[in-house]
């Protein structure tokens, strides 16, 4: 004979647990139904009546099967530096993530509590590590034979073009200028980065440090006992 199916509420067998989507009510000493996501327990069960569930009110939610007396409040609206990647519904909390060009400086369980703008590397410096959702851009000074003439959170140090005749040698923040109409070899996008000849490297001077409001994880140039944050702008 098939085992008889017990309907909630029911008293569990000694030593056994309640079934999936049920909970044990200590007061009634019965196995009772949980409420589905998007609902909460309006009336708890008794020995003779099951849990009465009700829908969550606006701006509240429950994500799991539950027997909570009140739904949870959704988080506050996303700030101007954030985008809402998940709306507040009866079944899920609002999730705010940082908008493009920003990263999460302080995360919470889901989404981000505090966004900060990605560091921009100033001319003479290129990106050494791109920003991620949770980490800032890292800048580095452009090595001999390379340059960056932009203030950017994405641009790398690019190789100088190589001239037949150099009008103005390149440096860390400026490409070489050729006298002839076209250089002998210009690094095309996606081209292999080749180390530059020594003659090109000797013309290179490091960009001079400038104080910055950027956090101390930015690139540091040695310039005394406590150098300022380097190679980036604070905005």
């Amino acid at each position: 004979l098939p085992a008889q199916v017990a309907f909630t509420p029911y008293a569990p067998e000694p030593g056994s647990t309640c079934r999936l989507r049920e909970y044990y009510d200590q007061t009634a000493q019965m196995c009772c139904s949980k409420c589905s996501p998007g609902q909460h327990a309006k009336v708890f069960c008794t020995k003779t009546s099951d849990t009465v569930c009700d829908s969550c009110e606006d701006s509240t939610y429950t994500q799991l099967w539950n027997w909570v007396p009140e739904c949870l409040s959704c988080g506050s609206r996303c700030s101007s530096d954030q985008v809402e990647t998940q709306a507040c519904t009866r079944e899920q909390n609002r999730i705010c993530t940082c908008r493009p060009g920003w990263y999460c400086a302080l995360s919470k369980q889901e989404g981000c509590r505090l966004c900060a703008p990605l560091r921009k590397c100033r001319p003479g410096f290129g990106v050494a590590r791109p920003g991620t959702e949770t980490s800032d851009v890292v800048c580095k000074p452009c090595a001999p034979g390379t340059f960056s003439n932009t203030t950017s959170s994405t641009d790398i140090c690019r190789p100088h073009q190589i001239c037949n005749v150099v009008a103005i040698p390149g440096n860390a923040s400026m490409d070489a200028v050729c006298t002839s109409t076209s250089p002998t070899r210009s690094m095309a996008p996606g081209a292999v980065h080749l180390p530059q000849p020594v003659s090109t490297r000797s013309q290179h001077t490091q960009p001079t440090p400038e104080p910055s409001t950027a956090p101390s994880t930015s690139f540091l140039l040695p310039m005394g006992p406590s150098p300022p944050a380097e190679g980036s702008t604070g905005d």
Partner: antibody, heavy 118, light 107 residues
């Protein structure tokens, strides 16, 4: 959770080819600079190749020891990076690690063994 | 190419001790230095970048310092889980280059 999983390693004869694949998940692949670092049987780490992101027009970089023989490529839609290794030499024998994020490496795969021997 | 020199090849220290590991570049690398830890049978793991910035999730007993061509990694109050090889890497210029590594053991 960030994951980089390398496949395609194995035993190959000198002069032959092999293609390594690195499948990734758990981070924004399209922004990441991806690369390969190998570790010789003597445990020395050697950077092999790197490919940067679309915003920089996907520039590629190679160690002198593999230039002209190895080619790095990526597929942002598949969140994967590849290393095509041609004209393999016995000195290419190593564990090959897939790496990501910038000119230093936040993320590493578990590595795949490449053995070049006759 | 920029050469990175780490010596000696191995180092032995007692638990609780402070250990300093050195790395020298063949030319100025302007703090473009990262440190990695590799435990036996595992992949390397980033500890430090920009010579002195601690990577997310790395215990604060690890610290990096240095400038120019001389850099060091310091481990305060050595723990048994710190038994590993430690590699430095310069990223100031391509090709990116690693030091030969230092194997740290417990006395």
């Amino acid at each position: 959770e960030v994951q980089l999983v390398e496949t395609g390693g194995g035993l190959v004869q000198p002069g032959k080819s092999l293609k390594l694949t690195c499948a990734t998940s758990g981070f924004t692949f399209s922004n990441a600079w991806m690369g390969w670092v190998r570790q010789s049987p003597e445990k020395q780490l050697e950077w092999v190749a790197q490919i940067k992101d679309k915003s920089n027009n996907y520039p590629t970089y190679y160690a002198e020891s593999v230039k002209g023989r190895f080619t790095i490529s990526r597929d942002d839609s598949e969140s994967s990076v590849y290393l095509q290794m041609n004209s393999l030499k016995e000195e290419d024998t190593a564990i090959y690690y897939c790496t990501g994020y910038g000119d230093f490496f936040d993320y590493w795969g578990q590595g795949v063994v490449v053995t070049v021997s006759s | 190419d920029i050469q990175m020199t780490q010596s000696p090849a191995s180092l032995s220290a007692s638990l609780g001790e402070t250990v300093t590991i050195e790395c020298r570049a063949s030319e100025d690398i302007y703090n473009g230095l990262a440190w990695y830890q590799q435990k036996p049978g595992n992949s390397p793991r980033l500890l430090i970048f920009n010579a002195n910035s601690l990577h997310t999730g790395v215990p604060s007993r690890f610290s990096g310092s240095g400038s120019g061509t001389q850099y060091s990694l310091k481990i305060n109050s050595l723990q048994s889980e710190d038994v590993a090889s430690y590699f430095c890497q310069q990223y100031y210029d391509h090709p990116l280059t690693f030091g030969s590594g230092i194997k740290l053991e417990i006395k």
